[in-house]
């Protein structure tokens, strides 16, 4: 994964902290796997790169991603609060310039190269699940997450509170 | 405008029970993650139980679990908390709190309910 | 469980003065990279009401004067300069685990 263009070094001169004009609150570099340990790993083809979930071999290094935190005001049409209240947003880069994107059309999750500031596209809302996972929800589509579905990633509708705790929208932030 | 009204506090004696309710109004109840956090008279906060939105997943401190239940019925917008075999050590104002959304942080507190356990 | 242990007891201090109040956990509350430690008012016969959250970062509607700092084991919370309606308790809660626990309070009264 990502053996093509060598393995990426992560500073902040690669991330510059102005996006949307709001810097971050702070970054984080960490593999993500699924609720089931599985990898998310990224490799180039055909000039594009193509996000993964698959079983790692047994001291195969994990893909890392950058991510980027902000702070928020939570949008009162969201949730029916008329309140400012506060949530944590992220974006994800797992190398020099390019972000998942949310393609909501497709119900895809993509690797786009993009210039700053990010689109909306780039910017998933964290919530902190059970049992040391989370979850990304998209931004631009209120109630869609990412999610896994045939071995890749995807958006995913969760219907209603009780569906927010499947698996297949859960993953692990790790930093090994 | 957001807002959580605790009842259903009073007085009662040690091995009793009693059901504290939160009414939550002025946001979506069911998306976010509620909890009760207690404070005995004089003393500081000590967090109780959560509940997530879809009443998935529930956590309690060691000295309530067994005795204390949370629940929630999101068709009526309603936090409870299920207090039984009440000791003295249980006098406290409990207070309902909704997370941030996402659930990171204590975000909304009600005014809170006076529970007095003594004979 | 993490134990926070807030210092000094008591603060008491002037208006206008700055309010320094620390608050050390008995582990790193740091998760997915946050400093997952929250900071508290409470003002007698009122419920708390957030602060900070995330270490430095300021809930809705909290004055600019109020600011957080601090990572792993050691935080701060700094009031610049005190307003009347500043005198108050001040707890930090740590969101990282299960329980999630508060530290004893911190009194700022008027000198």
């Known amino acids: 994964a990502f053996g093509i263009s060598g393995v990426q070094k992560y500073t902040r001169a690669l991330h510059d902290s102005s996006i949307t004009g709001i810097s971050p609150i702070t970054e984080y570099l960490a593999s993500l796997s699924t609720y089931n340990d599985q990898s998310i790993t990224f490799a180039l083809e055909d000039e594009s790169y193509e996000i993964y979930v698959e079983d790692l071999k047994k001291d195969e290094k994990k893909d890392k991603v950058l991510l980027s935190y902000y702070e928020s005001q939570h949008p009162s049409n969201e949730s029916g609060d008329g309140v400012d209240g506060k949530m944590l947003m992220v974006t994800l880069s797992p190398t020099k310039d390019f972000w998942l994107h949310a393609n909501n059309k497709e119900h895809s999750v993509e690797l786009h190269k993009c210039e700053k500031p990010l689109p909306d596209q780039a910017f998933f809302v964290l919530h902190n699940m059970h049992s040391n996972c989370v979850s990304f929800e998209c931004k631009t589509d209120p109630g869609v997450f990412i999610g896994v579905k045939d071995n890749h990633l995807a958006l995913i509708k969760v219907d209603s509170s009780e569906n927010l705790c499947t698996e297949n929208i859960l993953f692990k932030l790790s930093e090994t | 405008e957001v807002q959580l009204v605790e009842s259903g506090g009073g007085l009662v004696q040690p091995g009793g029970s009693l059901r504290l309710s939160c009414a939550a109004s002025?946001?979506?109840?069911?998306?976010?993650?509620m909890s009760w956090v207690r404070q005995a008279p004089g003393k500081g906060l000590e967090w109780v139980a959560t509940?997530?939105?879809?009443?998935?997943?529930?956590d309690y401190v060691d000295a309530v679990k067994g005795r204390f239940t949370i629940s929630r019925d999101n068709s009526k917008n309603t936090l409870y908390l299920q207090m039984n075999s009440l000791r003295a050590e249980d006098t406290a104002v409990y207070y309902c709190?909704?997370?941030?959304?996402?659930?990171?942080?204590?975000?909304?507190w009600g005014q809170g309910t006076l529970v007095t356990v003594s004979s | 469980e993490i134990v926070l242990t807030q210092s000094p007891a008591t603060l008491s201090l002037s208006p206008g003065e700055r309010a320094t109040l620390s608050c050390r956990a008995s582990?790193?509350?740091?998760?997915?990279?946050?400093?997952?430690l929250n900071w508290f008012q409470q003002k007698p016969g009122q419920p708390p009401r957030l602060l900070i959250f995330?270490?430095?970062n300021r809930g809705s509607g909290v004055p600019a004067r109020f600011s957080g700092s601090g990572s792993g084991t050691d935080f701060t919370l700094t009031i610049s300069s005190l307003e009347p309606e500043d005198f108050a308790v001040y707890f930090c809660?740590?969101?990282?685990?299960?329980?999630?626990?508060f530290g004893q309070g911190t009194k700022v009264e008027i000198k």
């Open positions: 709190t909704r997370a941030n959304y996402g659930n990171w942080f204590f975000e909304v």
């Open positions: 002025g946001f979506t109840f069911s998306s976010f993650s």
């Open positions: 509940i997530s939105g879809g009443k998935t997943f529930t």
């Open positions: 582990e790193s509350v740091a998760k997915y990279g946050l400093s997952l």
């Open positions: 995330a270490a430095s």
């Open positions: 809660q740590q969101s990282k685990e299960v329980p999630f626990t």
